[in-house]
């Protein structure tokens, strides 16, 4: 029951999460103009990853595509890839994950195949989350730099009264969003791996018996010792006989890979 | 079409108070920005301030700030402007106007004369 | 607060010539997020209210003939009236439509000879 409920829960926490990133990526409000030294303007400049806006006094707002490639800063263009990249996986992640989910079932799929599945969406989450983490830290560093830089030639005197004030743009509300999404994925990657731990029954150590059966030579065959690591394949002994015969409590026993995590 | 009807002509005397209306239609009255900008006989334009309906933001010119007060009332689409504390400078005709884009003042209406005098 | 200089004062020119007015401000207008100019230019004639003629230093309002135009950026403007009717006998305002408070110029007064 516990491992379902962690389970469900890194499931909609990575869901939300993945909701985020998908907004944070597309909001136009990663950086926004700071209104330090003029909290009321009329015109207000804010830039996201694929567009420039701004909006006026009057309401009307006017945004502009980077309609280049080439001419983006190398940095934005790597925003733009960590950020994709994130929803790609994460978006992989929850459609791997909607099959794993032990609450629902298809067909006879076996315990060990969810578990592998849940770990492989609890890893794909974990990168996605790090991804989009990564992207917004890249543009929040890449912001702070041209702020200082930018305050430090904030004015430019041109012959006596004349002055040209430069645009400086702060943090954006898609950084908060972004920052917090990719939190929110990566513990609801983790969620997922703790549930795969779970989910993968401890195979049961039967001592291992011989026994002959009129005409066919039939073993036994003991269960590996798992060091208790709370987690792996539910190796159910699987008894080998010549003669094809299986009893009802018969079950395989697979190596899993999630022996040694 | 866009229409701003301001209220009629006013006589204060110093140190009274005066309140314009202005009042629009042919629009959505919380769609646009509404400025208050006024003239002296002769002279130039001067801006008082600013009111977006839809929130009741207001900006005031620092010239006005403390005696001037906008407010809009939406269910009659309607905008005020009132001036306290009135001197004799204070004598000009008083425009109300719509913000367009690039903050440009469009639609003016006639004008409310405000006369201050003892 | 943005101080908007108009030259000249007033001018004479007969109908049929060009006429350029020249606006100055003391910071410049131009907005690096979108790369505008905020600069109106109104057109006031006697007994009337202003009416919009240019906005964004040089895009004319609908409605407004086409030998009105507006040019510069940053700090400098000109309006130019390429052939002066006689309707066009009016004082002309530019106006700081940047920064909080809207200033205006102290106008250019169009005389016709």
């Known amino acids: 029951m516990a491992v379902t409920a962690c389970q469900g829960l890194g499931f909609v926490v990575s869901l939300i999460g993945i909701a985020g990133i998908i907004a944070a990526t597309c909001m136009d409000q990663w950086s926004t103009q700071d209104l330090y030294n003029n909290p009321v303007t009329a015109v207000f400049n804010y830039q996201g990853l694929w567009r420039s806006c701004v909006r006026e006094s009057s309401g009307f707002t006017e945004c502009r595509g980077y309609f280049t490639l080439l001419g983006l800063p190398a940095m934005l263009q790597a925003v733009r890839a960590l950020m994709i990249v994130g929803i790609v996986l994460g978006a992989i992640g929850l459609l791997v994950s909607i099959f794993a989910l032990k609450c629902i079932r298809i067909g006879s799929m076996e315990d060990s195949a969810k578990a592998n599945m849940t770990l492989t969406s609890g890893i794909m989450f974990i990168v996605s989350g790090l991804c989009a983490i990564a992207g917004v830290s890249v543009f929040a560093n890449m912001l702070v730099t041209n702020f200082w830089m930018s305050t430090a030639n904030m004015y430019t005197g041109m012959g006596g009264m004349v002055q040209t004030v430069q645009t400086r743009y702060t943090f954006g509300a898609a950084l908060f969003v972004g920052w917090v999404a990719g939190g929110l994925t990566l513990i609801g990657g983790v969620m997922m791996c703790i549930a795969c731990r779970g989910l993968a029954p401890e195979e049961t150590n039967y001592k291992a018996v011989s026994y002959h059966a009129s005409g066919h030579s039939v073993a036994y065959k003991p269960g590996g010792f798992k060091a208790s690591t709370g987690f792996g394949s539910n190796t159910k002994n699987k008894k080998i006989y010549d003669g094809g015969a299986r009893t009802e409590d018969e079950v395989q026993s697979y190596p899993s890979k999630h022996d040694y995590v | 079409q866009v229409q701003l009807v301001q209220s009629g002509a006013e006589v204060k005397k110093p140190g009274a108070s005066v309140k314009v209306s202005c009042k629009a239609s042919g629009y959505t009255f919380t769609s646009y920005v509404i400025n208050w900008v006024r003239q002296a006989t002769g002279q130039g334009l001067e801006w008082i301030g600013e009111i977006h309906p839809r929130g009741g933001n207001t900006y005031y010119s620092e010239k006005f700030r403390g005696r001037v007060t906008l407010t809009a009332d939406t269910s009659i689409s309607t905008a005020y402007m009132e001036l306290s504390s009135l001197r004799s400078e204070d004598t000009a005709v008083y425009y109300c106007?719509?913000?367009?884009?690039?903050?440009?003042?469009?639609?003016w209406d006639q004008g409310t004369t405000v006369t201050v005098s003892s | 607060d943005i101080v908007m200089t108009q030259s000249p004062s007033s001018l004479a020119v007969s109908a049929g010539e060009m006429v350029t007015m020249n606006c100055k401000s003391s910071q410049s207008l131009l907005n690096s997020g979108n790369q505008r100019n905020y600069l109106t230019w109104y057109q006031q004639k006697p007994g009337q209210p202003p009416k919009l003629l240019i906005y964004?230093?040089?895009t004319r309002e609908s409605g407004v003939p086409d030998r009105f135009s507006g040019s510069g950026s940053g700090t400098d403007f000109t309006l130019t009236i390429s052939s002066v009717q006689a309707e066009d006998l009016a004082v002309y305002y530019c106006?700081?439509?940047?920064?909080?408070?809207?200033?205006f110029g102290q106008g250019t007064k169009l005389e016709i000879k």
């Open positions: 106006q700081n439509s940047y920064n909080y408070p809207y200033t």
């Open positions: 106007a719509i913000l367009r884009r690039g903050n440009a003042m469009d639609y």
């Open positions: 964004w230093a040089s």
